[in-house]
Interface confidence: medium
């Protein structure tokens, strides 16, 4: 079932510059992507950009540059000239239309820890919330255990002291695990029927849907415009990650399709998935 992720990032160098990253985890072929702010387009939101796989992109101020990052993800750079930086508290929504079955829209905003009003640059680690106390507790136990092991190893003078240096990839994955549930639990409060699935694949986005465009009919199988940047894990340091449920091009948004309120942090990241016949393409 299609998944959409949205991540909003504030540029470290310019506190007034923001980038919205959105991705579609398939299956199906993307027909149109709409990015809006202030809510979903058509439900109080304002359209910022529209990206079409064949016809290119169009954008409206304050959008600076909209482009395809991969065959299934886009980025939108925003220029915030105002001193008060209104983007800090704004919701951004991305809608991926996959005709004729519908569209999938998710919304996200800049995490509180990225408030441009802070005098110091925001910390790259999102604030962990109360609903993650269990994870924190477990982490604490593990850290204590590691510390104790280090203590024991130091006492063995005939052995060198190991230097524990967690990899960047692992810290990103931890960030994702910690951040996603808090967003999901908030969304669940707002929509009692929402089945939240804050899933993402820790590998590149291309592994989720590497041949999406090839599944289009030949007359629509052009590569997306813009340079296809390598798709790293779709969780960036100061980003928010929200996956809401499916909407039709409803400009309706939300997310997904499981029958119960599931929370999947690392779902089955299958490779290419065949586009179902229901799409009725030639």
């Amino acid at each position: 079932t299609p998944e959409v992720w949205v991540q909003v990032q504030m540029e470290a160098t310019e506190l007034s510059s923001f980038t919205v990253h959105c991705g579609f985890l398939g299956p199906g072929s993307i027909s149109l992507v709409t990015v809006s702010w202030g809510g979903p387009d058509g439900a109080g939101g304002t359209k910022l950009a529209v990206l079409h796989p064949e016809l290119g992109t169009r954008q409206w101020a304050p959008a600076r540059q909209a482009r395809w990052e991969t065959q299934s993800s886009i980025s939108l750079a925003l220029e915030d000239s105002g001193a008060s930086s209104p983007f800090a508290n704004t919701t951004f929504c991305c809608k991926f239309a996959s005709f004729p079955e519908g569209s999938w829209e998710s919304c996200g905003s800049l995490p509180p820890s990225s408030d441009p009003g802070l005098s110091a640059p925001p910390t790259p680690v999102p604030i962990l919330r109360a609903d993650l106390a269990g994870i924190l507790g477990l982490s604490g136990v593990l850290l204590f255990g590691c510390g104790y092991l280090l203590h024991l190893l130091r006492r063995q003078k005939h052995r060198p002291t190991p230097r524990l240096q967690p990899s960047h990839t692992n810290s990103q994955a931890l960030t994702a695990q910690a951040w996603a549930p808090s967003q999901a639990s908030q969304a669940a409060l707002h929509d009692p029927y929402a089945t939240i699935n804050t899933s993402f694949c820790p590998a590149t986005l291309d592994t989720a849907h590497p041949n999406g465009w090839a599944s289009l009919p030949t007359h629509a199988a052009h590569q997306p415009q813009g340079p296809a940047a390598s798709a790293s894990t779709p969780i960036l340091a100061r980003g928010s990650f929200v996956s809401v449920e499916n909407g039709l091009y409803t400009q309706a948004g939300e997310r997904p399709p499981h029958t119960g309120p599931g929370l999947t942090l690392f779902p089955d990241c299958r490779g290419p998935r065949a586009v179902e016949g229901r799409f009725g393409v030639r």
Epitope: L32, H52, A97, F99, P100, H190, Y193, E245, T250, G253
Partner: antibody, heavy 115, light 107 residues
């Protein structure tokens, strides 16, 4: 097989209220946004409202905003349209339709607003 | 709101004829246009979506083209079961809007 079955239509006086239902089967209801589309006798199609798959987002044209409310119960696989302050011009066959655009339609239910 | 202007409002044709119906959007909708067929007393049926993609089970004699503001539905060889009313619809933005319809009648 995808099936959408509308019910709840009937005769109502101007200013009155009515609630339409749309029972869905043959697909994962909670995965799809659904719309109501109406057709006045001898006229064309008019989109009336949409609701996202979880019910969070709803959409209406100006003609019905404030009078119609779309909702859904995913546990019951049912879509609703609560209509109030009905007018003669609301007389139409009301269809529920799935997808975007509307790939699957119900058979429709007739709503007649007349004194 | 995006207005969809469909023409002609009606036409008479014979079995085997090539029929063309046009739809003009009041603003650019890229390729987000669908076409429906409706017979008296029945619900509409989706024929074409995203300008040129045939929906599941739709015969190949139906085709769509266009982009931006001008769109066309073509029936390459009209069959007896094709006599009906056809509607275009933009699925680019809310509110959804339909064309006024084109009634295809037997000559």
């Amino acid at each position: 097989e995808v099936q959408l079955v509308e019910s709840g239509g009937g005769l109502v006086k101007p200013g009155g209220s009515l609630r339409l239902s749309c029972a869905a089967s043959g697909f994962t209801f909670s995965s799809y946004g659904i719309s109501w589309v109406r057709q006045a006798p001898g006229k064309g199609l008019e989109w009336v409202s949409e609701i996202s798959s979880g019910g969070t987002y709803t959409y209406y044209p100006d003609t019905v905003t404030g009078r119609f409310t779309i909702s859904r119960d995913n546990a019951k696989n049912t879509l609703y349209l609560q209509m109030s302050s009905l007018r003669a011009e609301d007389t139409a066959v009301y269809y529920c339709a799935r997808g975007d655009p509307f790939g699957y339609w119900g058979q429709g239910t007739l709503v007649t607003v007349s004194s | 709101d995006i207005q969809m202007t469909q023409s002609p409002s009606s036409l008479s044709a014979s079995v085997g004829d090539r029929v063309t119906i046009t739809c003009k959007a009041s603003q650019d909708v890229m390729t987000a246009v669908a076409w429906y067929q409706q017979k008296p007393g029945k619900a509409p049926k989706l024929l074409i979506y995203s300008t040129s993609y045939r929906f599941t089970g739709v015969p190949s004699r139906f085709s769509g083209s266009g982009s931006g503001t001008d769109f066309t539905l073509t029936i390459s060889s009209l069959q007896p079961e094709d006599f009906a009313t056809y509607y275009c619809q933009q699925h680019y933005s809310t509110p959804r809007t339909f064309g006024g319809g084109t009634k295809v009648e037997i000559k």
